[in-house]
């Protein structure tokens, strides 16, 4: 039985050229996190493996920084970065939990953060 929930930063916005932290948190479960995958659509951004550490996809190696924690910092944002991002938690024995973040990259100098929300 999967009892955990993923809390994410929800819908967020950031300025073009700036950076943003993508963050998820798994709670309400004692399952062991073995790996967290960060994806945009079906495209890999990065993996944080409990034993092996971080692997950054070639497509993002010049502008993704690991962390903080299991999160991901996306730098030098462009409008093409607008879209859905997923944190996929591989856990034992529960299985896989997925959280969703929607990022909007704005041309303007005003970028407001959305509210946090949960995905069971």
């Amino acid at each position: 039985m999967m009892t955990g929930t993923i809390e994410t930063t929800g819908n967020i916005s950031a300025e073009k050229g700036g950076s943003i932290i993508l963050q998820c948190h798994l709670s309400s479960t004692t399952a062991q996190v073995t790996q967290v995958n960060w994806e945009q659509q079906d495209q890999l951004l990065a993996i944080c493996n409990a034993d092996l550490g971080w692997h950054i996809s070639p497509s993002f190696k010049d502008r993704v920084a690991p962390g903080p924690g299991l999160g991901l910092t996306l730098q030098s944002l462009t409008v093409n970065d607008t879209g859905e991002y997923f944190c996929i938690y591989h856990t034992y024995p529960d299985g896989t939990y997925t959280g969703r973040i929607f990022l909007e990259v704005l041309e303007s100098s005003v970028a407001e953060h959305g509210a946090r929300f949960q995905i069971p």
């Epitope: 790996q35 993996i47 092996l52 550490g53 070639p58």
Partner: antibody, heavy 120, light 107 residues
Amino acid sequence: QVQLQQSGGELMKPGASVKISCKATGYTFSNCWIEWVKQRPGHGLEWIGEILPGSGSAYYNEKFKGKATFTADKSSNTAYMQLSSLTSEDSAVYYCARQKYGNYYYFDYWGQGTTLTVSS
Amino acid sequence: DIQMTQTTSSLSASLGDRVTISCSASQGISNYLNWYQQKPDGTVKLLIYYTSSLHSGVPSRFSGSGSGTDYSLTISNLEPEDIATYYCQHYSKLPYTFGGGTKLEIK
């Protein structure tokens, strides 16, 4: 020493599916990506995609989505690639290769290749 | 996708020669380039990664250089076992793509 041993050549009929294997020895199987590469005469080498055997995380070249499916069996240190709905365009030599986990973006050891012939 | 072009598909040289194989990318790839050797029997080996780093066990007569869109592999003193096809591959972003290969033959 690191070795990748691939299954033998296959002669398949159009429309069928085939599963090619790649057995890894000489290193910790779960800790490295297995890459799959296609080689057709006159078409050079084409990257199909990759799987991280420890978690089963797999990523595909857009061109091969729906055609190739990767799996891995940690108990036998073997990676598999299934190709479906075969056509003559799938006739090729297929290679598996190793890419170390982390920021190592090169295929440092290769299998000997598996020749697939699709013919009615 | 980034296109990798090896304009010379085949090259003939004499033993002891210095041979240079070139590769160009359709856009800048920031030195994110590898070179592989494929022997006539199909065996593939990594030679050079990140433009100029020699993979372990590869003879020092192999070297790589380049920047931006243009890269090259040099064999300083051609030996019989170097008869093979050589491929460049970028890893600037996915999908990885390879050049069409340069087949090296002995005169």
